[in-house]
């Protein structure tokens, strides 16, 4: 806490300008009016204040707005935002996308800090849902943002927002997250034609059920191996050799290099060896010819 001291004669700040960088901490405290600072926050960023001086300016704003800063001030915080704690930010009510962008710009190039995470959380909660413009903004600054959300949080994403998602935004998503996102993507892209639909839905297919993969196999889509390897194992297992061949097209040649990895390994174990042989890749481990395959899950359902 800086001691309350009277401002020396002639040092009272009339405006926020470069002369203030020569002020000692106690002089800033005594000579800068908090209301003046609040109205001229946009100037602070252009002045090379030290970290200690910024601490003083933050302290003045905290005194002026103990319940949290108004958005007019927040929007112009600039580098002062880096001085804010998550507790400070929880007091804010940020509704403007421009304000959000301005603050994310300050943190650009760095990993998501607790302050930024709190800011985003406040912003999204204030809006009620993760709309397209917000998602566009957040993924532009943090490509991994979507995958940092829990499945519960993702459930509030409206299908219309899915149009803003780029393939790289889903790189770190796990199957539980894709399970939530895939139905939304399917809904969002439902009016597109076959090949265009596949290009858009491809990144979300890690959440696709077997019946959708079967349907895709009838559409000459030529799914690449990288996408196939990200499919849910339980969705891949029921596919026949013919369906996988149709689904992958020329990419089926890549199965050989992946035969020891999931889901290919588990899928091979479920296929008849003579069916696997038709792929011409020397895949081994299928059910030997002449063996009877019992579907025990079906048997249980009947009893």
């Amino acid at each position: 806490e800086v001691e309350k001291t009277a401002c020396p004669s002639g040092k009272k700040a009339r405006e926020i300008d470069e002369s203030l960088i020569f002020y000692k901490k106690w002089e800033l405290e005594a000579c800068v009016d908090a209301a003046l600072l609040a109205t001229q926050m946009d100037r602070v960023n252009a002045i090379p204040f030290t970290y200690e001086q910024l601490d003083v300016l933050k302290h003045k704003l905290d005194e002026l707005y103990p319940q949290g800063y108004p958005e007019s001030v927040i929007q112009h915080l600039g580098y002062l935002f880096l001085k804010m704690s998550p507790e400070d930010i929880r007091k804010w009510n940020v509704t403007s996308l421009e304000t959000l962008k301005a603050l994310l710009e300050v943190n650009k190039g760095h990993e998501m800090s607790p302050q930024v995470a709190t800011l985003i959380d406040r912003f999204v909660k204030g809006r009620g849902q993760l709309d397209k413009d917000t998602l566009d903004t957040l993924t532009a600054f943090y490509p991994g943002y979507l995958c940092s959300l829990s499945p519960e949080e993702l459930s509030s994403v409206p299908p219309s927002s899915i149009w803003a998602v780029r393939p790289q935004d889903l790189d770190t998503c796990d199957p539980r997250q894709l399970d939530v996102l895939y139905p939304k993507a399917r809904l969002a892209f439902q009016n597109m034609n076959g090949s265009e639909y596949f290009v858009k839905i491809q990144s979300f297919l890690g959440g696709a059920p077997t019946e959708d993969l079967k349907a895709l196999s009838q559409q000459n889509v030529s799914m690449d191996l990288a996408t196939f390897m990200k499919l849910r194992t339980d969705a891949v297992l029921p596919l026949t050799v013919a369906e996988v061949q149709k689904l992958l097209g020329p990419h089926v040649e890549g199965l050989k290099a992946e035969e020891r990895h999931r889901p290919v390994r588990d899928w091979i174990l479920r296929q008849r060896q003579d069916d696997l042989d038709t792929l011409g890749l020397g895949l081994q481990g299928g059910i030997p010819n002449g063996y009877l395959v019992l579907d025990l899950s079906m048997q249980e359902a009947l009893s």
Partner: antibody, heavy 121, light 107 residues
Framework: QVQLQQPGTELVKPGASVKLSCKAS????????MHWVKQRPGQGLEWIGN????????YYNERFRSKATLTVDKSSSTAYMQLSSLTSEDSAVYYC??????????????WGQGTTLTVSS | DIQMTQSPSSLSASLGGKVTITCKAS??????IAWYQHKPGKGPRLLIH???ELQPGIPSRFSGNGSGRDYSFSISNLEPEDIATYYC?????????FGGGTKLEIK
Amino acid sequence: QVQLQQPGTELVKPGASVKLSCKASGYTFTNYWMHWVKQRPGQGLEWIGNINPSNGGPYYNERFRSKATLTVDKSSSTAYMQLSSLTSEDSAVYYCARPYYGSSYGYFDYWGQGTTLTVSS
Amino acid sequence: DIQMTQSPSSLSASLGGKVTITCKASQDINKYIAWYQHKPGKGPRLLIHYTSELQPGIPSRFSGNGSGRDYSFSISNLEPEDIATYYCLQYANPLRTFGGGTKLEIK
């Protein structure tokens, strides 16, 4: 050891068709797809397409879809490429190649010696 | 399709010297690149696969490097039998594509 045998030369007239062969030995023919590659005089290598020898299913480079037809005869472990409506542009050396599936879609570890096709009247 | 841009198209070097050839892919090929030596009247000979893995029997004078879209291939201690045309091949996609080739001559 693995061998891919191709006839040395073929001389054909413009407008005709030709069927080039590639006889495989030293490995299980139906465990590796067969690929075909073209090299025009003084030019680089160009991938034509490949064929699954087990079910006869081919895939083509779009540029060769209406020019080449790939087939196999499992009983003789031989792959064929038929080239139709021949012009001087088709004069080239044609190679068959077998991939090794160590990673991704596989690189070619065995090649035939190539068949030199000359299209001339 | 993935395009492979190989350079230079030809080069001349002295015996015992070192040469480097580059291939640039039109997209990330995840190190799935092979290098071949091709002499007239023969099929291409595999030298390197997966960017830098030397084929059995290939001398360590041959080496490869790179990642993403940019790859290089070098021959050090050049010998007379290295006179040939060299090609890169991407196999990150089932529709394989070759670089345009580099013809190596000895000064």
